[in-house]
């Protein structure tokens, strides 16, 4: 099946201090390689989460990514702060032959708006 990375929500709004879920699904796990979430684009983009076993504070996977047929790579960001605002991209990589993995497809992005906490 042809690989497609889908981020269904163009934007989400969340109150500061709350949690939000950023959805991402794939149509294929091939070619093999990791899935990562970034905020922003280009050289300055920030790695938010990687499905490769590392620990990321405040960010967790929603589904059981250890299922060998898992296609859901959604994440939950907890205790959101204004600094978390921005556009988040779910990115599929192809493993590299003894070199850095190659980005092969990105979702369309989900913009996160952080609302002031109601007083």
């Amino acid at each position: 099946k042809e690989l497609k990375v889908t981020q269904p929500e163009k934007s989400v709004s969340v109150a500061a201090g709350d949690s939000t879920v950023l959805n991402c699904t794939l149509t294929s796990l091939l070619p093999v390689g990791p899935i990562k979430w970034y905020r922003g684009v280009g050289q300055s983009r920030l790695l938010i989460y990687s499905f490769t076993g590392e620990h990321f504070p405040r960010v967790t996977n929603v589904s059981d990514a250890t299922k060998r047929n898992n296609m859901d790579f959604s994440i939950r960001i907890s205790n959101v702060t204004p600094e978390d605002a921005g556009t988040y991209y779910c990115v599929k990589f192809q493993k590299g032959p003894s070199e850095p993995d190659t980005e092969i497809q990105s979702g369309g992005g989900t913009e996160v708006y952080v609302l002031a906490k109601p007083s």
Epitope: V32, R68, S98
Partner: antibody, heavy 118, light 107 residues
């Protein structure tokens, strides 16, 4: 330190059953997929079965499908392998192994010996 | 099936390369496992093609290209004498496979 300790091996007759256990410590067991691998006397390593972190998804090599069942109890940090209808060909050292994110292995137990003999 | 040589030998200080072929680079990740004696616990020396666990010496390295993976031991030592198994995880079939093992003899 990550530690995996298998138990439950022993001598059984052909056709009998055995349940192996693997006690895990030193890591968040409920976050990792796990596998069972065996080694028959004088032979190489053979992957048998794997299970997802939550326990809902299981995977088997064809030769044990229907006879062996992998399961886990995350509340007890334990992995299991139920083996039914054992034959002499199942005689081996059985290892549990922790899986990496891409379903290879990073940590192994010391193994437990299963002998099937009449 | 993954294919690796039955045996290799080297003198201390030499570089040893053990190959493992038969996987599909598009769908396979490789790992390498060291077993010093039959029935003893395997030790992971490489996983994810080229990732070395923190407690494994830097003389061990891994690579994968095309349909093959390679374990390289640079400056082999007597204590590296063991059987080395390659393994593959196939993302098409969700199945793990081991090679038959390569016996490394350090002369």
């Amino acid at each position: 330190d990550v530690q995996l300790v298998e138990s439950g091996g022993g001598v059984v007759r052909p056709g009998e059953s055995l349940r192996l256990s693997c006690a895990a410590s030193g890591f968040t067991f409920s976050s990792y997929a796990m596998s069972w691998v065996r080694q028959a006397p004088g032979k190489g390593l053979e992957w048998l079965a794997g299970i997802s972190a939550g326990g809902s998804d299981t995977y088997y090599i064809d030769s044990v499908k229907g006879r062996f069942t992998i399961s886990r109890d995350n509340s007890k940090n334990s992995l299991y392998l139920q083996m039914n209808s054992l034959t002499a060909e199942d005689t081996a050292v059985y290892y549990c192994a922790r899986e990496t994110w891409n379903h290879l292995f990073d940590y192994w137990g010391l193994g437990t010996l299963v002998t099937v003999s009449s | 099936a993954l294919t690796q040589p039955a045996s290799v030998s080297a003198n201390p200080g030499e570089t040893v390369k053990i190959t493992c072929s038969g996987g599909d680079w598009y769908s396979t990740y490789y790992g390498w496992y060291q077993q010093k004696s039959p029935g003893s616990a395997p030790v992971t020396v490489i996983h994810s093609d080229d990732k070395r666990p923190s407690d494994i010496p830097s003389r061990f390295s891994g690579s994968a290209s095309g349909s093959a993976a390679t374990l390289t031991i640079t400056g082999v030592r007597v204590e590296d004498e063991a059987v080395y198994y390659c393994a593959g995880y196939d993302g098409r079939t969700y199945i793990n496979t081991f090679g038959a093992g390569t016996t490394l003899t350090v002369l």
